[in-house]
């Protein structure tokens, strides 16, 4: 397939990954699908340095990331191990709060206004960040 040595138009390159920052909101699952249609995934934060980069670009706005516990344990959408990986939760979070009155708890993680993470109702229409790795982006999938 054709080699991609740089990020697509309107994406930002950082440390061999490409990032796209939405300016409108969708529910977590719809944001996840959006990223998939871009051959990407919701952002997976693996270091404090990456956290600061994303935080700089999103500003003080609730923004979905690729972390959820809809099936039980917390999982990153790309398979990165949650237990041993980077975390940046707000104090007392995640709390799977049921008091919002919307039914169920809180199963999807987002950046809050100070950049630290919170779990929230997955249906809330927050902004989101897509990420794709440059090496991965340069490989065409085989034709079926």
């Amino acid at each position: 397939g054709s080699e991609r040595t740089c990020c697509p138009v309107n994406w930002v390159e950082h440390e061999r990954s490409c990032y796209w920052f939405s300016r409108s909101g969708k529910a977590w699952a719809d944001a996840d699908n959006y990223c998939r249609l871009e051959d990407a995934h919701l952002v997976v934060v693996t270091s404090w340095e990456e956290q600061k980069f994303v935080q700089h670009h999103i500003g003080p706005v609730n923004t979905w990331m690729g972390l959820h516990d809809q099936n039980g344990p917390w999982k990153w959408v790309d398979g990165t191990d949650y237990e041993t990986g980077f975390k940046n939760w707000r104090p007392e979070q995640p709390d799977d709060w049921y008091g919002h009155g919307l039914g169920g708890g809180e199963d999807c993680a987002h950046f809050t206004d100070d950049g630290r993470w919170n779990d929230d109702v997955c249906q809330r229409p927050y902004r989101w960040v897509c990420e794709t790795e440059l090496d991965k982006a340069s490989q065409e999938p085989p034709l079926l």
């Epitope: 409108s24 969708k26 699952a29 871009e38 051959d39």
Partner: antibody, heavy 118, light 107 residues
Framework: EVQLLESGGGLEQPGGSLRLSCAAS????????MNWVRQAPGKGLEWVSV????????FYADSVKGRFTISRDNSKNTLFLQMNSLRAEDTAVYFC???????????WGQGTMVTVSS | DIQMTQSPSSVSASVGDRVTITCRAS??????LAWYQQKPGKAPKLLIY???SLQSGVPSRFSGSGSGTDFILTISSLQPEDFAFYHC?????????FGPGTKVDIN
């Protein structure tokens, strides 16, 4: 000029198969997700399927899931829709359409007619 | 799935008239809505995206408004070439869904 041109439609019996093609020109084909949308005679528009730009992700309407397969050949700027186990209710004009970043369809082909009848 | 409804299903109008078409979503889609024009035997044409943004090349007499569940397409002064079908589409969630369409014909 940005263009999409569908082909492959025709008359097929229930249970049969057809493969639709959509030839794209005038834009960087591999950079855009592509869709199939259909319109039964005298009816509204129905979204059928979408495939990501590099082909790694696909989604389908429930009405065609398990019967239709969307695919693409970026080296030939061509989108496909493999239609198996055809039913009378699949009779429609099938359009291919280019997706924008707003999840809408800014370029459409002229359509190809699929008729499923015994 | 998100259901889309449109009203009226048809409207008769004259050249120069102001025409409004309403689209309603079965759940909140914020501003993820598009409008298309379709003439008989032709493909749809994108008019409005993101509820109110005018697609490049579309005349300014077309405008869109609304958010959440209720949206409006307005044609400020109907022209002869505007007699057609108009479809709304929600772009919030897969499966993408369309309204049943509104026919604008000559009074």
């Amino acid at each position: 000029e940005v263009q999409l041109l569908e082909s492959g439609g025709g008359l097929e019996q229930p249970g049969g198969s057809l493969r639709l093609s959509c030839a794209a020109s005038g834009f960087t084909f591999s950079s855009f997700a592509m869709n199939w949308v259909r319109q039964a005679p005298g009816k509204g528009l129905e979204w059928v399927s979408v495939i990501s730009g590099r082909g790694g992700n696909t989604f389908y309407a429930d009405s065609v899931k398990g019967r239709f397969t969307i695919s693409r050949d970026n080296s030939k700027n061509t989108l496909f829709l493999q239609m198996n186990s055809l039913r009378a209710e699949d009779t429609a004009v099938y359009f291919c359409a280019k997706r924008t970043g707003d999840d809408v369809f800014d370029v459409w082909g002229q359509g190809t007619m699929v008729t499923v009848s015994s | 799935d998100i259901q889309m409804t449109q009203s009226p299903s048809s409207v008769s109008a004259s050249v120069g008239d102001r025409v409004t078409i309403t689209c309603r979503a079965s759940q909140d889609i914020t501003s993820w809505l598009a409008w298309y024009q379709q003439k008989p035997g032709k493909a749809p044409k994108l008019l409005i995206y993101a509820a109110s943004s005018l697609q490049s090349g579309v005349p300014s007499r077309f405008s869109g408004s609304g958010s959440g569940t209720d949206f409006i397409l307005t044609i400020s002064s109907l022209q002869p070439e505007d007699f057609a079908f108009y479809h709304c589409q929600q772009a919030n969630s897969i499966p993408f869904t369309f309204g049943p369409g509104t026919k604008v014909d000559i009074n």
